[in-house]
Interface confidence: low
């Protein structure tokens, strides 16, 4: 009685059970009662990553230089190409199918962490007594200078954005 | 809102260059894909290349073999696109038209176009 | 280089109705297909993206639709301003290529 279900790594065809073709390979043509599966590499710029009966192996994601990726792992016959952003960008998503520049936070705000090749620069609010005066992908908030410890009093008072302006005291008489 | 303005229109003679310029108002291009499309009277779209602003990479169409260069100068916010040995039939008119790296090729932002006109 | 195919190349419509308007690529693009508005005298202006994103701004009445090497756009009730030439763009491979452009003009 022909089979309704097959082994692990086969696959149903013509009341028969065929050997899947490895990862690397592709289908030429199924097996028959007389002959194996027949199965052929995939070129040097394709890959196929599981035991198949594709005909057509998958070409290899190409790591578009105008999109800002390069080449973080070259495919094989088995593997897909991995892509990564180029310095100074990061994945706009998941698939990493483009790239886009780090944010830079603006004054007012620092660096809580810096981008990497997929995440983006986290920026946080300078707290009272921080400021940040520039718009930076890599500055921390910086803390306002200390008048008192250069024997010095505070003229004008800082925001998240200035640092304190500090002055000499007023000498009493 | 994001504009492009291009450059005047062009009266050219046979195996002349012309050199149209694409002017960002708004945005820096740092972040956008520059691509340039010309369209015939009464033909379709056709893509000439694109310029990443970012790195300065291109790629051309190789229908245009050579003839095409893009370039930009960033500080300017402008991008442009030189065509050599011109023929009557690159008579069109030119647009260039940018995108946000997302979605490199799609363009959200288009000039008004320029046109460009060879004859003897 | 990636043949898109538009049809039909003229489309007669009545205001209010529905548009349907196809692209085929010569192979298989997934769904790298962006659909454009062109008005004589204009730039054209991006509607859909992705095959089916709609650009921020765009009327819901337009709605892209497919995947590999079928794409179709559809203006759901047509008014007055949607009359014009659609191209749809594959942006899968280079050299980007455009469709011969459907026209959609008032019956």
């Known amino acids: 009685e022909p089979p309704t279900a097959c082994r692990e790594k086969q696959y149903l065809i013509n009341s028969q059970c065929c050997s899947l073709c490895q990862p690397g390979q592709k289908l030429v043509s199924d097996c028959t009662e007389f002959t194996e599966t027949e199965c052929l590499p995939c070129s040097e710029s394709e890959f196929l990553d599981t035991w198949n009966r594709e005909t057509r192996c998958h070409q290899h994601k190409y790591c578009d230089p105008n999109l800002g990726l390069r080449v973080q792992q070259k495919g094989t016959s088995e593997t897909d190409t991995i892509c990564t952003c180029e310095e100074g960008l990061h994945c706009m998503s998941e698939s990493c199918e483009s790239c886009v520049p780090h944010r830079s936070c603006l004054p007012g705000f620092g660096v809580k962490q810096i981008a990497t090749g997929v995440s983006d620069t986290i920026c946080e609010p300078c707290p009272v007594g921080f400021f940040s005066n520039v718009s930076s992908a890599f500055e921390k908030c910086r803390p306002w200078t200390s008048c008192e410890t250069k024997d010095l009093v505070v003229q004008q008072a800082g925001t998240n954005k200035t640092d304190v302006v500090c002055g000499p005291q007023d000498r009493q008489r | 809102q994001v504009q492009l303005v291009q450059s005047g229109a062009e009266v050219k003679k046979p195996g002349a260059s012309v050199k149209v310029s694409c002017k960002a108002s708004?945005?820096?291009?740092?972040?956008?894909?520059v691509n340039w499309v010309r369209q015939a009277p009464g033909q379709r779209l056709e893509w000439m290349g694109l310029?990443?602003?970012?790195?300065?990479?291109?790629t051309y169409n190789q229908k245009f073999k050579g003839r095409v260069t893009l370039t930009i100068d960033k500080s300017a916010s402008t991008a442009y696109m030189e065509l050599s040995s011109l023929r009557s039939e690159d008579t069109a008119v030119y647009y260039c038209?940018?995108?946000?790296?997302?979605?490199?090729?799609?363009?959200?932002?288009w000039g008004q176009g320029t046109l460009v006109t060879v004859s003897s | 280089e990636i043949v898109m195919t538009q049809s039909p190349a003229t489309l007669s419509v009545s205001p209010g109705e529905r548009a349907t308007l196809s692209c085929k690529a010569s192979?298989?693009?997934?769904?790298?297909v962006a659909w454009y508005q062109q008005k004589p005298g204009q730039a054209p202006r991006l509607l859909i993206y992705l095959a089916s994103d709609r650009r921020t701004g765009i009327p819901a009445r337009f709605s892209g639709s497919g995947s590999g090497t079928e794409f179709t756009l559809t203006i759901s009730s047509l008014q007055s301003e949607d009359f014009a030439v659609y191209y749809c763009?594959?942006?899968?491979?280079?050299?980007?290529?455009f469709g011969q452009g459907t026209k959609v003009e008032i019956k």
């Open positions: 763009l594959q942006h899968w491979n280079y050299p980007l290529t």
């Open positions: 708004v945005y820096s291009f740092t972040g956008y894909t």
């Open positions: 310029i990443n602003p970012y790195n300065g990479r291109t």
């Open positions: 192979q298989n693009v997934h769904t790298r």
């Open positions: 038209a940018s995108s946000y790296y997302s979605n490199p090729y799609a363009n959200d932002y």
